[in-house]
């Protein structure tokens, strides 16, 4: 697994470099997680033919994965920094149970799946420092999460492969939207 942002040898070798601002750190953290997702997607695509499936076919699923909508204030039209930040943090917290599901889904990239999970936690902490209105954030209910995880793990092999693919794709899209929005803040 690649080393987390700020821990590569280049950072050690360049003590004169300015420390990263909070926005730069968040940007770097998201890009690091996206790299991890790419590696996981590579293993998934090599293992199954899910990646060739059309978006329409994959849309027929009952997963309630977090998704950016116009009302979330993260798009250029109707952009609202605080509403958007709340959406990003809430969405990342909702993704956590799906990242937990991914932990036993990889053979050669097991470490990478763990790195994505842990790096997402770090990202949430960075973003929380930036948010003014934490009261607006609803954290997932553990009881609901537990029954969701049980349900996902009870699926047949084909559905589990599809679920893995959908989680990775949705998480990638959510992070990309978040990255674009955060660059406007």
């Amino acid at each position: 697994a690649p080393v987390p942002p700020g821990e590569d040898s280049k950072d050690v070798a360049a003590p004169h470099r300015q420390p990263l601002t909070s926005s730069e750190r968040i940007d770097k953290q998201i890009r690091y997680i996206l790299d991890g997702i790419s590696a996981l997607r590579k293993e998934t695509c090599n293992k199954s033919n899910m990646c060739e499936s059309s978006k329409e076919a994959l849309a027929e699923n009952n997963l309630n994965l977090p998704k950016m909508a116009e009302k979330d204030g993260c798009f250029q039209s109707g952009f609202n920094e605080e509403t958007c930040l709340v959406k990003i943090i809430t969405g990342l917290l909702e993704f956590e149970v799906y990242l937990e599901y991914l932990q036993n889904r990889f053979e050669s990239s097991e470490e990478q799946a763990r790195a994505v999970q842990m790096s997402t936690k770090v990202l949430i902490q960075f973003l929380q420092k930036k948010a003014k209105n934490l009261d607006a954030i609803t954290t997932p209910d553990p009881t609901t999460n537990a029954s969701l995880l049980t349900k996902l793990q009870a699926q047949n092999q084909w559905l589990q492969d599809m679920t893995t693919h959908l989680i990775l794709r949705s998480f990638k899209e959510f992070l990309q939207s978040s990255l674009r929005a955060l660059r406007q803040m």
């Epitope: 956590e96 902490q125 553990p142 999460n145």
Partner: nanobody
């Protein structure tokens, strides 16, 4: 598994305050979420509030603005600060821990009695 022990309950007058503690022992204390629940006499157990691993709190509507949950990871303890108590807050209060994102509340305390008299 984590062992949870609640303390701080008692008999108080309506309008007063009380702070409950939930001390954890056992495994390293960094659960995904810690929750407070209560069971009023003759009723089912109900959700009071929770605090997640990053410190974000959520509350039941009935206690919002009156109750506050906090945690001290150095002391392996979670607190429930209860202000402006009402007779309908009378219940046995339980704390619970969810060790991972998908585990549900997998550890529960024995409960502490809170009685609010009018």
């Amino acid at each position: 598994a984590v062992q949870l022990v609640e303390s701080g309950g008692g008999l108080v007058q309506a309008g007063s305050s009380l702070r409950l503690s939930c001390a954890a022992s056992g495994r390293t204390f960094s659960p995904y979420t810690m929750g407070w629940f209560r069971q009023p006499p003759g009723k089912v157990r109900e959700f009071v509030g929770r605090i997640n691993w990053s410190g974000i709190t959520n509350y039941a509507d009935s206690v919002k603005g009156r109750f506050t949950i906090s945690r001290d990871n150095n002391k392996n303890t979670v607190y429930l600060q209860m202000n402006r108590l009402k007779p309908e807050d009378t219940a046995v209060y339980y704390c619970a821990a969810a060790s991972r994102s998908g585990s549900g509340y997998d550890s529960w305390g024995q409960g502490t009695q809170v009685t609010v008299s009018s």
